[in-house]
Every structure is written in C-alpha cells, then in structure tokens.
C-alpha cells in the first residue's frame, strides 16, 4: 500500500514578450514568493499507517527535510520524546539501531528518513489514535521533532498523510527575526504583485511523488525537492496512551530528570556533524568501571529505581514515568 503525497512544484511564469529588464524585476518577487511558501515548511514529517493484514500492526515513517547531516533519530509514542512519551527506537547512522517492545523493526529508508514497524497484542499494542513522534538531531540545525497519528476514522491499510508538527523547535529570537523579514518580504511581494496585476499569476502544479523510499539506504533527495514539500501543520493530541508504558522503558530505570523549569522555546545549534564522526578508537575512552555499556541493538543494562543521574529531592514519585512525565 503506497500513499501518494501531493507536492506542489513552484513554477515561475514564462517571460513571454517581456524584455530582460522586466524579467529581472520579476526575479525578486519569485524569490520572495518562494520564501513565503517555504517559510513554514516543517523540518520533520511523520506518517502513520495501520497495516491491513494485522490490525495491531503500525508502520511509522519519518523524514527530515533539513540540509544537515542526521546524527540521531528517536521515535517515541504517547507524546513528544521526553515530554511523557515512551521511546520505541533510536537510530544512529553509523553505530546502529536500538529498539524496544513493541517495536518490531526499525530501519533507515534513506539518509534522511526512517521507518518503524510496531506490533503487539493486548496492553502493549498501540491504540488507533496513539500519537507517534520522531525527533531528528542534525548538524547544524539542532534537534527537531514532529508528531502524527492515524485519523480516528482511518480504515486498516490506509495511512495518514505526512503530518509535520514541530514542537518547540526554534529559537524565539530567530523566529521573530526571520518572521519579521519574511513578513516584510511577503508584504512587499503583495505590493509588487498588485502592481503587476495584468501579468499571469504563478501556476502551482501539483506533481505526484511517492514517499515510499527504497529499502536500501539511498542518498537523500535533493534540497530543491525537499524544499518543495509543503504540508499544512497538523497538531495531534491523543488521550490514548499505551497501558504498559513502563514495560517499554528503554533503559530500565527512571530518566535523567523528572520535570525541568520551562524556558523559552529553543532550538540548539549543533557543534559538529555527528553523523560523519567516526567511532572513536577503542583506546580513546577509559571506562571508570568494568561494567560495559549495552552494545548497539541490545537492551541497555537495567538500572534500579534509585539510580538516576539527577535525583529529585522530592523522592521517587517525582521521577515518575519512564521518561520523566512533565
């Protein structure tokens, strides 16, 4: 079952009989129009599909539309990663994949997209309206996350369209600054378009592209085609949470911290291209204790309820939830 996504391709009008000067004056409006159209283009898209053959089986596909190299992808359910959600899989471009029940198979589809198959029965099975979130860490963009879920009325075998829903992912000052520039540009563009009323309007021709990527890891699509993808934002809330959230706990114990003081929305800038970072030589790190980390693909060691990096003075209930419920 392949779901076709509508991708509007922006095409400037033909120059026609206009002279070079007239053509040149139209360059700026088209640049501005492209900015206006792509200004809200989300960095991450999420697609959720219920398999027709198995009603308890879900396929989650996520993609990153940024230009940087991806260093890590985290897939969670029940809410955003770290905000009440439970981690299902973590994918590293070089070091491998870690996944936890009920995730059955996580894999890279391209260098900028992944897929995850979930299966389960009973309590561990995802609900039809469960929210699934994908978080991409990349250089130099930083971390971006989007969530999606099946529409309540979805039939098995049908998939929700890619639903980009960024969650607190941009530096506030950056947003305001860029928004101001874009707003001015869009106003200016409208002014120019009003002056050129007699000229034909731009044609938006939808071209059909399949989001289904080949099974092998292929090169990411060109930035031009990535920038063309523009899907309206969709924020999806769900009251359905997995009944056995704690059993899917990725590291067996409480998370780093329970609830942190909230600051302004922030999108950190990555210092380096982690994805292209080679694995350090065996001698480059010295382990303080003999216990080994879990190898890629295996479950990490179980940690007791008291072994938290940031113990909370309010007691164990303050660290409630596998990933620190807000």
């Amino acid at each position: 079952m392949r779901t076709e996504a509508q991708v509007p391709a922006l095409q400037p009008p033909e120059p026609g009989l206009e002279g070079a000067m007239g053509h040149r004056t139209l360059v700026l409006p088209w640049v501005l129009l492209t900015l206006c159209v792509t200004a809200g283009t989300p960095e991450v898209w999420v697609q959720v599909r219920m398999e027709a053959t198995e009603l308890s089986s879900f396929t989650i596909r996520c993609g990153f539309l940024g230009s940087g190299s991806i260093s890590l992808v985290t897939v969670s359910w029940g809410g955003p990663n770290g905000a009440g959600g439970t981690t299902l899989a973590v994918l590293h471009p070089e070091r491998g994949i870690r996944q936890w029940a009920p995730a059955r198979q996580a894999r890279w589809e391209t260098q900028s997209s992944i897929s995850l198959i979930l299966e389960g029965s009973g309590a561990s099975s995802p609900c039809a309206n469960t929210t699934f979130c994908c978080k991409f860490a990349s250089f130099p963009e930083g971390s971006w996350e989007a969530c999606g879920s099946l529409p309540p009325s979805s039939d098995p075998g049908l998939s929700a369209p890619p639903t980009p829903a960024p969650i607190l992912r941009a530096d506030l000052a950056g947003i305001l600054g860029v928004s101001g520039v874009l707003l001015f540009g869009c106003v200016y563009l409208l002014h120019l378009l009003r002056r050129h009323k007699h000229r034909p309007a731009p044609r938006l021709q939808p071209s059909r592209t399949s989001p289904q990527a080949p099974r092998a890891r292929a090169w990411a699509p060109s930035q031009a085609s990535q920038a063309a993808l523009h899907v309206p934002y969709a924020t999806i809330n769900t009251s359905c949470r997995p009944a056995t959230l704690d059993t899917a706990h990725p590291h067996g114990g409480p998370s780093w911290w329970a609830s942190l003081p909230t600051h302004a929305a922030h999108r950190p800038q990555g210092p380096a291209a982690w994805a292209s970072t080679p694995i350090p030589a065996r001698g480059s790190f010295v382990s303080v204790e003999n216990g080994l980390y879990a190898q890629a693909g295996e479950r990490p060691p179980h940690t007791g309820p008291g072994l938290t990096l940031f113990p909370d003075p309010r007691g164990p209930r303050a660290m409630e939830g596998p990933l620190g419920v807000r």
Epitope: L72, G82, G85, R95, H251, G324
Partner: nanobody, 121 residues
Framework: HVQLVESGGGSVQAGGSLRLSCEAS????????MGWFRRAPGKERDEGVA????????KYADSVKGRFTISHGNGKYILYLQMNSLKPEDTDMYYC??????????????WGQGTQVTVSS
Amino acid sequence: HVQLVESGGGSVQAGGSLRLSCEASGYSYSGDCMGWFRRAPGKERDEGVATIDNAGRIKYADSVKGRFTISHGNGKYILYLQMNSLKPEDTDMYYCAAGWTFGGNCSPADWGQGTQVTVSS
C-alpha cells in the same frame, strides 16, 4: 524539549583550573547519557571529553583522565566538568550534550551552544 546552557569557560594559565557548568531546562530529557564534548577550531570532528550515563557509569577521554572530573548537582539539573592541571592543548570550545549510548559511546541528541576554554602557557 531540553535546553542546555553552558557556563564557566574562560582564560586560564597552564596548570590552572576551571569548572564548567551545564544547566538543563525545558522538557524532561529521555536519553540515557550526558556529557562534555569539545571541538577546537580547524578540527573536523568533536571529541568526547567525559560522559556519564543514567546508571552512573563514567567515561573519560585518555587525554583528560586524572585531570578532569564529571559530576552532577545533587537534586539539581546541572552537570559539571571540573578541569584541573589544564594544558594549552585543552584549549577548545566545550559543549554540553545529552543523548543515547551506542556501543559504549554517548551519541548526542541535544547540545548546548558551547563555552570557550583557553589555556595559555
């Protein structure tokens, strides 16, 4: 979403000490490791300096073992890096990062903006 803010960087003479701090705020974090990474100008990749996972396991780079100590504030959302016996080669931009362990290495998913450490001879 977690926000990591470093502080404590600066200039110091060789043999001196600095203490870097990393304060976390925002949403709770879901990874299983956190640490300090550095990158000098012109270097092609970042180097793990010291990392700690949520079971308390600590790892240090060979070049800093015995001189640097990673720790966290008790009951506070702060990560520290105590840097003693600093050398000129320790001059770098130091980043606080949080992420997931893969094969024994902490792979950052979120990181701070960095704090500059300069050691003069």
